[in-house]
Amino acid sequence: DAHKSEIAHRFKDLGEQHFKGLVLIAFSQFLQKCPYEEHVKLVNEVTDFAKTCVADESAENCDKSLHTLFGDKLCAIPTLRDSYGELADCCAKKEPERNECFLKHKDDHPNLPPFVRPDAEAMCTSFQENAVTFMGHYLHEVARRHPYFYAPELLYYAEKYSAIMTECCGEADKAACITPKLDALKEKALASSVNQRLKCSSLQRFGQRAFKAWAVARMSQKFPKADFAEITKLATDLTKLTEECCHGDLLECADDRAELAKYMCENQASISSKLQACCDKPVLKKSHCLSEVENDDLPADLPSLAADFVEDKEVCKNYAEAKDVFLGTFLYEYARRHPDYSVALLLRLAKKYEATLEKCCAEADPSACYGKVLDEFQPLVEEPKNLVKANCELFEKLGEYGFQNALIVRYTQKAPQVSTPTLVEAARNLGKVGSKCCVLPEAQRLPCVEDYISAILNRVCVLHEKTPVSEQVTKCCTGSVVERRPCFSALPVDETYVPKEFKAETFTFHADICSLPEKEKQMKKQAALVELVKHKPKATGPQLRTVLGEFTAFLDKCCKAEDKEACFSEDGPKLVASSQAALA
């Protein structure tokens, strides 16, 4: 499948609109501080060059690799060293080291101002004046803040965004139409971002084998009627394109994703009965739809797993002859029977099975040793089931905000050295698991809860890696991805932590808090709760509830007062004093 010109090949496959969008995303993810206008200039230059290569594939430089072409573009920016410092050192390297160097400099937490959505009228004016520029800004702003965002999926979200604007800008009350729709889109995009970051982390840290195992498990749950060869083919293709996107090879990734969708739609009969509705859609919607498609119905009369994986005398022989294939078959067979398990749990079970075979196949009578392996899975299954039950009960009792606060206390006690904004972000996101998963039917809860939590904890790990402060977090983050959630759940209160000394200014508030939207008000209160726990890590639940209650009452009172600032100045110190007394 060799092409004389890689860039011409991708331009023709993707079409100009998607090509330009992907190049913009790529540049924005690598150079996260550059303004939109600078990136657009580069995108236009690359697009013009691609068009010359389409016209004549033998034209000068058209035979160069995409890494070389894109890298040369980035390295030609005159202000590169001033803006990016040591990232400019990458330019002294040759490919493929240069691209690896760019990847290492991607920043998961760039120092960028939070993105503030303009008011609806202003947005509609901008959109109607120039929809392409408006959507370009969206791609740029999301990509630079989320340097591992799944590029073809970001194009899908941009399409959704555009459709919302087209629909709402014709309405009388534009804001009423736009706000809830964009809020929902933002939630989905943020979830997509953390899920993709987990995939990239898994590939970066543990390589293709680990990611492929994840893909086999997930695909087997979704497509239980497909045979093992079909699942292996899909998992291999998904691994390849995910690696491309994580590696910044966005044109190849998007092209391969479209190819995979095409293949799935052409082979529905051997994959799943649920694909038809997705396959009728255009390319971006089709791929998105396939990625979210519901699990197919289980085939009737699936035999017991024990026959092939426990009772068969050939287990060790099969394992010795083709270790990865045999374990892959085990994972496939287990996963297709258990759509009610999380992928993380399925991978832990496969790991347990592998460890059992490693131990037992070395013995003189292996079958006597591995004969009870399926029974030994029971504690591994019970642990996340109990976690889901306990946390969903807590969520139902406290509601989302209260549940988030319980998690703030829990996680601050586990890792009090972690920065307050990171703890608030993590606990708020972990708390969303309630409204996202606990409302689902019983059989869907466990996969929803554990796989969502795994993605959120990966975000914690990625941020912590940048500035490691907690030994407990490092311990959980450096282990295997599938063991992270149980590791964090099992973390005790960090007894090595020396409580933070009390600073009155940390708990001093002003009238400006009153004008904040409810969500931001909550975050301020939650930041104060983190600080309280850092000050008094051994504070009890009732003590903290008392202080938080008083704090909420104080805010309500002062925000209703005639002279708000005077109220804050007068009652603030009283609140600080009573809080200290309550926690003494």
Partner: nanobody
């Protein structure tokens, strides 16, 4: 590609001895328990003896206990079966297998005990 090559069989008189060898390749021999099985004419496969990966644990069928000794040399990827005090009923094709398998993978080696 897993390969198991048995050798050392032959014709021997009752009470005589033979030493069978099995050379293994295509897998990490030192990590797997190994087994000797045999198949007499017109009979099913019979498990004879097993040994752990390190050679520190051995098992024998009652019919061969005290007469046969299983051993291995992981440096040479080779499994052995020392057969003493052979009896006519030991006549069979002998196979080595991986980890308790009763499914002969190699060609086997013929042992005939007859006067």
């Amino acid at each position: 590609q897993v390969q198991l090559q048995e050798s050392g069989g032959g014709l021997v008189q009752p009470g005589g001895s033979l030493r069978l060898s099995c050379e293994a390749s295509g897998f990490t021999f030192s990590r797997f328990g190994m087994t000797w099985v045999r198949q007499a004419p017109g009979k099913g496969v019979e498990w004879v003896s097993g040994i752990s990966s390190l050679g520190d644990s051995t098992l024998y069928a009652d019919s061969v206990k005290g007469r046969f000794t299983i051993s291995r040399d992981n440096a040479k990827n080779t499994l052995y079966l020392q057969m003493n005090s052979l009896k006519p009923e030991d006549t069979a094709v002998y196979y080595c297998t991986i980890g308790g398998s009763l499914n002969p993978g190699g060609q086997g080696t013929q042992v005939t005990v007859s006067s």
